[in-house]
């Protein structure tokens, strides 16, 4: 049952004498494995014997007998899928039909494959795209219906017999669908390749020529042109004539139209291969070319630069840059249309010729204010001298010059005065628009460039102003030299360094931080009374009476300043002690008597001691000694002693008389 056998392989295989053939083949026998395989050459079915007759190239049987031909022919298949064959070498007489006789346990099949073996290697086939245009990449394909593992070949590309530089990509196919070798070459043809012969050459592994195919390239391209001009250098003077001729060196397909262009713009009514320019003017200077078109597109010739020579035109001056800042660099450029270019220039500053300046550019490395003004120039070439143009204005800007701060007040200035200063300058460009003052203060500027300082401070030492346009120029600071009364006056105790004790030598000094003018006088006062006129107040032996509030005054021609009040404290031992008696020094017995120890001391008495007429100390230590009830025996002389941190003092004796009461007298 034929439906049970399915084969896949190329229908025809091609080779040449001495090469080899590789036959990719697959099959499927559904009823079981292959038991017998015979490869016939041109098999014929014999109806009588019901068998195939023909040359047996290969036989595979159960007993494994293999004919000698099997060395050349190999079955590379298996019992159920693969039926690939190889014939190596292959001969001319192998051409014809190969028959694959397959037998399984129950089925038989004859599969036929065509083999075409030529006497010599057959040529490859070059495939070209339908149209080739210049500079457009195309792929050239060289195809050979041959590939065999045992016989390596190569395909090489030649242009006009010379190997092509471009890298080709070679691919092979040995499949049940197709057997071939292919080489693909990517190539960007130029117009010059038109009509050239391209060859694909088949070579063996050693590079020996086997066969080839050739094609002629038909490269479509725009017209290729050559332009000729008379005179050949294309340099003329105004009024001369010029002829230009356009020649087509190649065009594929043929050209259709001709035109001329100047500086890229088409010239009207110029549609022939010759362009005649009569009595040229300088405006006709420029780049000329001819343009010829075909179906591919327009082609342009190279450009011819026509130079119409003329004397310089009136010149203009360009300044880099104006306004210019003083100290910066400036460049002047003389611009004049001329052909040939000017060879000599004459420069003018404010109408006066600038000596030694003959170049197109004038460079001033450091601009100064006097460089300002009008600059003009004259250009000269072989055809003549141009005219002087209107010129250009150079504006030189600079900070205000010679700025000074001027005090408007009569001198000297005193603390508290209103001071007016002005800011003056010599010149400025651009104009001064504002002023600055140092140091900054809450000061008035009644008008531009004038500063008014109300109630000037003693410590306003210097003032500087700046006049400003785009820049500020500072004046040197001006000293106000403000005069003021002495400041920070104080009393300083020079000696002793510790507390002042009565009898000490004491020195007080009147000190202050500053005074202007420096010449000063001193005054000392105590409780509003003038004590002295020296800077120092000396006490050879201080007494408690000297204690009190002291001030010193320092004056100069501007005014006087007093110190803070300074308290002079004198420490002394208790003095002027006395015993006072209350209600009096005569007291009736039974009543109350109070003795008080009065004293003058600094610091105050801290401890009292009482004594009787026998100098016997009494057990009382307070300022008051209270006797209650007083007895006649209390009569007698008493004294007290006071003690402080400085020392002791004692009182004179004070006598207390205690007399009898009427009751006591009555009892007696």
């Amino acid at each position: 049952d034929s439906s049970k056998w399915v084969f896949e392989h190329p229908e025809t295989l091609y080779a040449w004498e001495g090469a080899c053939v590789w036959i990719p083949c697959t099959y499927r026998a559904l009823d079981g494995d292959l038991e017998s395989f015979i490869l016939f050459h041109n098999p014929e079915y014999n109806k009588n014997t019901s068998k195939f007759d023909g040359t047996r190239l290969y036989e595979s049987t159960k007993d494994g007998k293999v004919p000698s031909e099997q060395k050349r022919v190999q079955f590379l298949g298996d019992k159920n899928k693969n039926c690939t064959l190889s014939i190596h070498p292959v001969h001319l007489n192998d051409s014809g039909q190969l028959g694959l006789r397959m037998e399984s346990k129950t089925e038989k099949w004859m599969e036929r494959i065509h083999l075409n073996v030529s006497e010599r290697p057959f040529p490859p086939h070059i495939q070209l795209p339908p149209e080739i245009q210049e500079s457009q990449e195309v792929t050239l394909t060289c195809l050979l219906n041959f590939s065999c593992y045992g016989y390596p070949i190569q395909l090489q590309w030649l242009l006009e017999g010379v190997p092509m530089r471009q890298a080709a990509v070679t691919s092979t196919s040995l499949t049940i669908k197709s057997v071939f070798t292919r080489s693909e070459l990517k190539f960007s043809p130029q117009w010059s390749h038109h009509g050239k012969i391209v060859t694909c050459q088949l070579q063996d592994a050693d590079g020996k020529f086997l066969s080839n195919d050739t094609v002629q390239l038909n490269v479509k391209h725009t017209p290729k042109l050559e332009i000729k001009v008379t005179p050949s250098d294309a340099i003329v003077r105004e009024g001369d004539s010029v002829t230009m001729t356009c020649e087509v060196s190649s065009s594929n397909p043929e050209y259709t139209t001709v035109s001329w262009l100047k500086d890229g713009t088409s010239l009207k009514k110029q549609n022939t291969f010759t362009l005649n320019l009569r009595e040229v003017t300088k405006d006709q200077s420029g780049k000329y070319c001819c343009q010829v078109s075909n179906d591919v597109g327009p082609g342009r010739s190279e450009e011819v630069f026509l130079q119409v020579q003329y004397a310089p035109e009136p010149s203009t001056v360009q300044i880099l840059h104006s306004p210019a800042v003083e100290g910066s660099q400036v460049e002047f450029l003389c611009m004049s249309l001329a052909n040939p270019l000017p060879t000599n220039y004459t420069w003018y500053h404010n109408g006066k010729e600038m000596q030694g300046r003959t170049e197109e550019k004038v460079h001033i490395p450091k601009i100064l204010p006097w460089h300002a003004g009008t600059y003009s120039c004259v250009a000269e070439n072989i055809l003549g001298t141009g005219q002087r143009g209107p010129g250009a204005e150079l504006d030189v800007q600079y900070p205000p010059k010679k700025v000074t701060t001027v005090i408007q007040n009569p001198m000297p200035i005193r603390e508290g005065d209103t001071v007016t200063l002005s800011c003056n300058y010599n010149s400025s460009n651009p104009s001064v628009t504002r002023y600055e003052w140092k140091p900054h203060g809450a000061w008035e500027e009644p008008s531009l460039g004038v500063l008014k300082i109300q109630n000037v401070g003693w410590d306003n030492t210097t003032i500087a102003c700046a006049a400003c346009n785009s820049w500020c120029s500072w004046a040197s600071p001006v000293a106000l030299n403000v005069q003021y009364a002495p400041r920070d006056v104080r009393v300083r105790k020079i000696k002793p360094l510790s507390e002042i004790h009565s009898g000490n030598s004491v020195s007080l000094q009147c000190d202050f931080s500053s005074s202007h003018p420096k010449e000063v006088q001193f005054f000392w006062e105590k409780n509003g009374r003038l004590l002295g006129k020296e800077s120092q107040l000396n006490f050879d032996s201080i007494s408690p009476e000297d204690a009190g509030s002291y001030s010193c005054w320092v004056n100069n021609s501007i005014g006087q300043t007093a110190s803070k009040a300074w308290t002079l404290e004198v420490l002394y031992a208790p003095r002027r002690l006395r015993v006072s008696m209350s209600p009096g020094d005569q007291v009736m017995e039974g009543k109350s008597a109070t003795l008080t120890c009065e004293s003058d001391a600094n610091p105050p008495v801290s401890h009292y001691t009482w004594f009787d007429w026998n100098n016997q100390s009494l057990p009382y230590h307070s300022q008051k000694l209270r006797l209650e009830p007083v007895k006649v025996q209390h009569s007698g002389a008493y004294w007290c002693q006071g003690t402080n941190s400085v020392g002791k003092g004692r009182s004179p004796l004070s006598t207390l008389t205690v007399y009898y009461s009427p009751e006591t007298i009555g009892r007696r």
Partner: antibody, heavy 119, light 112 residues
Framework: QVQLVQSGAEVKKPGASVKVSCKAS????????MHWVRQAPGQGLEWMGI????????SYAQKFQGRVTMTRDTSTSTVYMELSSLRSEDTAVYYC????????????WGQGTLVTVSG | EIVLTQSPLSLPVTPGEPASISCRSS???????????LDWYLQKPGQSPQLLIF???NRAPGVPDRFSGSGSGTDFTLNISRVEAEDVGVYYC?????????FGQGTKVEIK
């Protein structure tokens, strides 16, 4: 011995006033000027003003003008510093310091009073 | 007002080594009689400031002689000849020439 003893710590609300006292002992109270200095947390010393205990005259730093009042009571040898319209930045330790009559240096300092101002 | 500028603001020291602090005034503190009204104070951690040097170079009573003050006019220096551990704290200069009294920012001295 000579010493200045200040009143204790105070906590006040913003806008309130505080009155700190400084009691002098061991010397003649009226013979020496008294200054007030404050120190905000982690900051330096800042002078506030001076009072003459003898006559009661004062001089204040520009910054505190109108908010600070310094007074004295000679009977108790005490000076006072009152700061009004308190704000959080017034949180500081406030010191009284005696001015040495010879040199003008602050030879004796109080122990300080912490005033905290918080909402 | 007079502005006092101290430097450095922080001073790490090694015990036994010398140390110095600078104080610069915005105007001269020298008086008519030649006194420089600049004082130095030390504020130890958690304590009130204490007087070290008065009128530029005079040591206050009880201050060790390793402390000394020098300078005149606008530039003053406090020197510690050999730093001891108890000298740590913040040192301030103050001008006593005029009211308002002004202080430097303070220099923090700490042991390395």
């Amino acid at each position: 011995q000579v010493q200045l003893v200040q009143s204790g710590a105070e906590v006040k609300k913003p806008g309130a006033s505080v009155k700190v006292s400084c009691k002098a002992s061991g010397y003649t109270f009226t013979s020496y000027y008294m200054h007030w200095v404050r120190q905000a947390p982690g900051q330096g010393l800042e002078w506030m003003g001076i009072i003459n205990p003898s006559g009661g005259s004062t001089s204040y730093a520009q910054k505190f003008q109108g908010r600070v009042t310094m007074t004295r009571d000679t009977s108790t040898s005490t000076v006072y510093m009152e700061l009004s319209s308190l704000r959080s930045e017034d949180t500081a330790v406030y010191y009284c310091a005696r001015e040495d009559s010879g040199s003008g240096a602050f030879d004796i300092w109080g122990q300080g009073t912490l005033v905290t101002v918080s909402g | 007002e007079i502005v006092l500028t101290q430097s450095p603001l922080s001073l790490p020291v090694t015990p036994g080594e010398p140390a110095s602090i600078s104080c610069r005034s915005s105007r001269s503190l020298l008086s008519y009689h030649g006194y420089n009204y600049l004082d130095w104070y030390l504020q130890k951690p958690g304590q009130s400031p204490q007087l070290l040097i008065f009128v530029g170079s005079n040591r206050a009573p009880g201050v060790p002689d390793r402390f000394s003050g020098s300078g005149s006019g606008t530039d003053f220096t406090l020197n510690i000849s050999r730093v001891e551990a108890e000298d740590v704290g913040v040192y301030y200069c103050m001008q006593s020439l005029q009211t308002p009294r002004t202080f430097g920012q303070g220099t923090k001295v700490e042991i390395k």
